[in-house]
């Protein structure tokens, strides 16, 4: 990805998805009526013109927000602590990798706008998730809906990272 982002970053992202999957506590079949449109900003991860700074910023903010969401008293009460600790550790490692990378990308002169804009959009999205959890009184079903939503958005963000990686590979081989 044009910086010292380790090859295992993609693996860490997949591990995060696996952990989120394992964290399931109740059957999602019981929670259909609690579905909500959180309006994940798809346009942010679907574009074909991927800038390194944009991808790094989206991933960094996503992981930062997931870390914050699952690093609260409410979250500790809702989830298996062993899995939660593993999630925190994995997210912390990924954030460290990305921060190193972001510093280099900024140093290479990529625009600050490409970094600040996705961050603001994602903060609004996660604020909507927090409001929903509060509104639903942090019920098991509310957490289950949020877990599934985060798996979906993280999956889309990881896909964006893979697309940039393969684009870089194509450029490197041509």
């Amino acid at each position: 990805l044009g910086c010292d982002l380790p090859q295992n970053h993609g693996l860490l992202s997949r591990n995060t998805l696996v952990l989120l999957h394992q964290m399931r506590r109740i059957s999602p079949f019981l929670c259909l009526k609690d579905r909500r449109d959180f309006r994940f900003p798809q346009e942010m991860v679907k574009g074909s013109q991927l800038q390194k700074a944009h991808v790094m910023s989206v991933l960094h903010e996503m992981l930062q927000q997931i870390f914050s969401l699952f690093h609260t008293e409410r979250s500790s009460a809702a989830w298996n602590m062993t899995l939660l600790d593993q999630l925190h550790t994995g997210l912390h490692q990924q954030l460290q990798h990305l921060e190193t990378c972001l510093l280099q990308v900024v140093g290479e002169g990529e625009s600050a706008g490409a970094i600040s804009s996705p961050a603001l959009t994602l903060r609004r999205y996660f604020q909507g998730i927090r409001v929903y959890l509060k509104e639903k009184k942090y019920s098991d079903c509310a957490w289950e809906v949020v877990r599934m939503e985060i798996m979906k958005s993280l999956f889309l963000s990881t896909n964006m990272q893979e697309r940039l990686r393969s684009k870089d590979r194509d450029l490197g081989s041509s």
């Epitope: 999602p28 079949f29 259909l32 009526k33 579905r35 979906k152």
Partner: antibody, heavy 121, light 107 residues
Framework: EVQLVQSGAEVKKPGESLKISCKGS????????IGWVRQMPGKGLEWMGI????????AYSPSFQGQVTISADKSISTAYLQWSSLKASDTAMYYC??????????????WGQGTLVTVSS | DIQMTQSPSSLSASVGDRVTITCRAS??????LNWYQQKPGKAPKLLIY???SLQSGVPSRFSGSGSGTDFTLTISSLQPEDFATYYC?????????FGQGTKVEIK
């Protein structure tokens, strides 16, 4: 392109067993649930049950509980509907369809082409 | 289980007519209601989801409304390809349930 491709038509005798399939492609198979729907000749749609292929969690309509078994093999992106002992009244068209689970997206947006099951002595 | 009741069970109409089909749930299902169209020998096709959202690729003459227990599917100007059977389905809670269907025939 998203596709659900079902196995071909079956002609069976009462008391025989049967397993029909529904193969998903063009999307992340474990990110969607697969539902099964029955349509008896000249009748309406009846919801049978659903499976989450990511962990094979299932739920059935009370009318079909104990009558059929729904399963999935995520390694080959395929869901199954099976009977251990068919009856003449199982004669119908069976459809599979994908469901987005708890994600906010269209329900049952893609359907298989249907599998016609005929049970006759 | 939630019962879904559609009316009418069949109707005759002409090309260009405005057609309305109603669906009533035995208890509140919020906006978790879908409408499907089915033609003979074909799989059902999703038209409307979450009561009023038009599925991608479906003509804008189809619209849905309602919430709670009472829902409506409207075809603003019936086209020859719209003669089919229409089903409502609730996805608020399992088991999902369908209405009995409304057959739209040519007058």
């Amino acid at each position: 392109e998203v596709q659900l491709v079902q196995s071909g038509a079956e002609v069976k005798k009462p008391g025989e067993s049967l397993k029909i399939s529904c193969k998903g492609s063009g999307y992340s198979f474990t990110s969607y649930w697969i539902g099964w729907v029955r349509q008896m000749p000249g009748k309406g749609l009846e919801w049978m049950g659903i499976i989450d292929p990511s962990d094979s969690d299932t739920a059935y309509s009370p009318s079909f509980q104990g009558q059929v078994t729904i399963s999935a093999d995520k390694s080959i992106s395929t869901a199954y509907l099976q009977w251990s002992s068919l009856k003449a009244s199982d004669t119908a068209m069976y459809y599979c369809a994908r469901h987005p689970g708890l994600n906010w997206a269209p329900d049952f947006d893609y359907w298989g082409q249907g599998t016609l099951v005929t049970v006759s002595s | 289980d939630i019962q879904m009741t559609q009316s009418p069970s069949s109707l005759s109409a002409s090309v260009g007519d405005r057609v309305t089909i109603t669906c009533r749930a035995s208890q509140s299902i919020s906006k978790f209601l879908n409408w499907y169209q089915q033609k003979p020998g074909k799989a059902p096709k999703l038209l409307i989801y979450f009561a009023s959202s038009l599925q991608s690729g479906v003509p804008s003459r189809f619209s849905g409304s309602g919430s709670g227990t009472d829902f409506t599917l409207t075809i603003s100007s019936l086209q020859p390809e719209d003669f089919a059977t229409y089903y409502c389905q609730q996805s608020n809670t399992l088991p999902f349930t369908f209405g009995q269907g409304t057959k739209v025939e040519i007058k």
